[in-house]
Interface confidence: medium
């Protein structure tokens, strides 16, 4: 019976079986609903709107990573319909805590206002003042979002999974 169907399955009246909802391709998201035994008559896939992306399947389109606002970092690569944005070095006034890579929200840049004393990226920095990320001074060519780190969500960084 339809109540036994899974999250992405609908009940096929003809076969009497649960059937997989048609998955969407990269850059698309489901239109209307399908799952737990029911499927809207006009269910289908539609392209992601501007500023959003999807890897396909049953994912809804999500906004590109907010490098500046959320991660406090510069934009390395803007996103498209199929790919998230990639973030680069930290913005001025923020620093990468390289010895603490276990952030469940992704590799974010932290505020210099709360930095430990003598944090090199924040020396002389106050709110909004310049704070250089080590990668900009030749010590590393990686952005904070390219450092090897412990994977926490099993699905990549927050906002990219």
């Amino acid at each position: 019976e339809y109540s036994n169907c899974g999250e992405n399955e609908y009940y096929n009246q003809t076969t009497g079986l649960c059937q997989e909802c048609p998955p969407c391709g990269p850059g698309e998201e489901p239109y209307l609903s399908c799952g737990y035994g029911t499927k809207d008559e006009d269910y289908g896939c539609v392209p992601c709107p501007a500023e959003k992306f999807s890897k396909g399947g049953y994912q809804i389109c999500r906004r590109h990573k907010d490098c500046e606002g959320f991660f406090r970092a510069t934009v390395l690569t803007p996103g498209d319909m199929e790919n998230d944005a990639e973030c680069g070095p930290c913005l001025p006034g923020y620093y990468m805590l390289e010895n603490r890579p276990r952030n469940i929200y992704g590799m974010v840049c932290y505020s210099c206002l709360l930095a430990p004393p003598n944090t090199k990226e924040c020396v002389g920095a106050t709110s909004g003042a310049s704070a250089n990320f080590p990668g900009t001074s030749g010590s590393s060519t990686l952005s904070p979002f390219q450092h090897a780190h412990k994977e926490l969500s099993g699905q990549g960084h927050l906002a990219t999974a």
Partner: antibody, heavy 121, light 107 residues
Framework: EVQLKKSGPELVKPGASVKMSCKAS????????IHWVKQKPGQGLEWIGY????????KYDEKFRGKATLTSDKSSSTAYMELRSLTSEDSAVYYC??????????????WGQGTSITVSS | DIVMTQSPASLSMALGEKVTIRCITS??????MNWYQQKPGEPPKLLIS???SLRPGVPSRFSSSGYDTDFVFTIENILSEDVADYYC?????????FGTGTKLVLK
Amino acid sequence: EVQLKKSGPELVKPGASVKMSCKASGPAFTTYVIHWVKQKPGQGLEWIGYINPYNDYTKYDEKFRGKATLTSDKSSSTAYMELRSLTSEDSAVYYCASKAAYYVGNAMDSWGQGTSITVSS
Amino acid sequence: DIVMTQSPASLSMALGEKVTIRCITSTNIDDDMNWYQQKPGEPPKLLISEGNSLRPGVPSRFSSSGYDTDFVFTIENILSEDVADYYCLQSDNVPLTFGTGTKLVLK
């Protein structure tokens, strides 16, 4: 620091769904992650999941996947949690809690007062 | 999932005594342990965050120590206002997991 305002208590029937809200005021809503935590009467705390309001990225504890759905509305700075197919096991206080992503650490540091859900016929 | 073993489940202490609560994790979480206080009818309050860091405004009689899998939370010279439930939370990995809680009451 973000302030979180809960929705009112609810008495709901078994099998029904309920949607509770958590309105944030203070710093920019999209620079915070909103977590949801369950506490049954006289019992401990259980983490349900979190949502990043900027792009609606969600992460759930597997035991709540299919039971809870987290959403948010940036225009009103409000996070929502919908619970479906309610049973008496879902009777609890549900807390929303926030974490500023750009301050060191992962733990929730600001909590709402909690929304009480009672499931009874 | 990371399993949290918190002990004791309850403590009956006299004013001015020292309280010690322990949390053991099923896997190494480095120093990603947090401690919350919850008073009746209130939401939890974060007292100590990762790296054994006392939160701003929290009295210095609260402290914690530990690394990897073994963590201890201490209240020196308890006051009547410390009567509450205390929870540990690991924030090293999702799903975040809480300890089962310790109820602190006065003798």
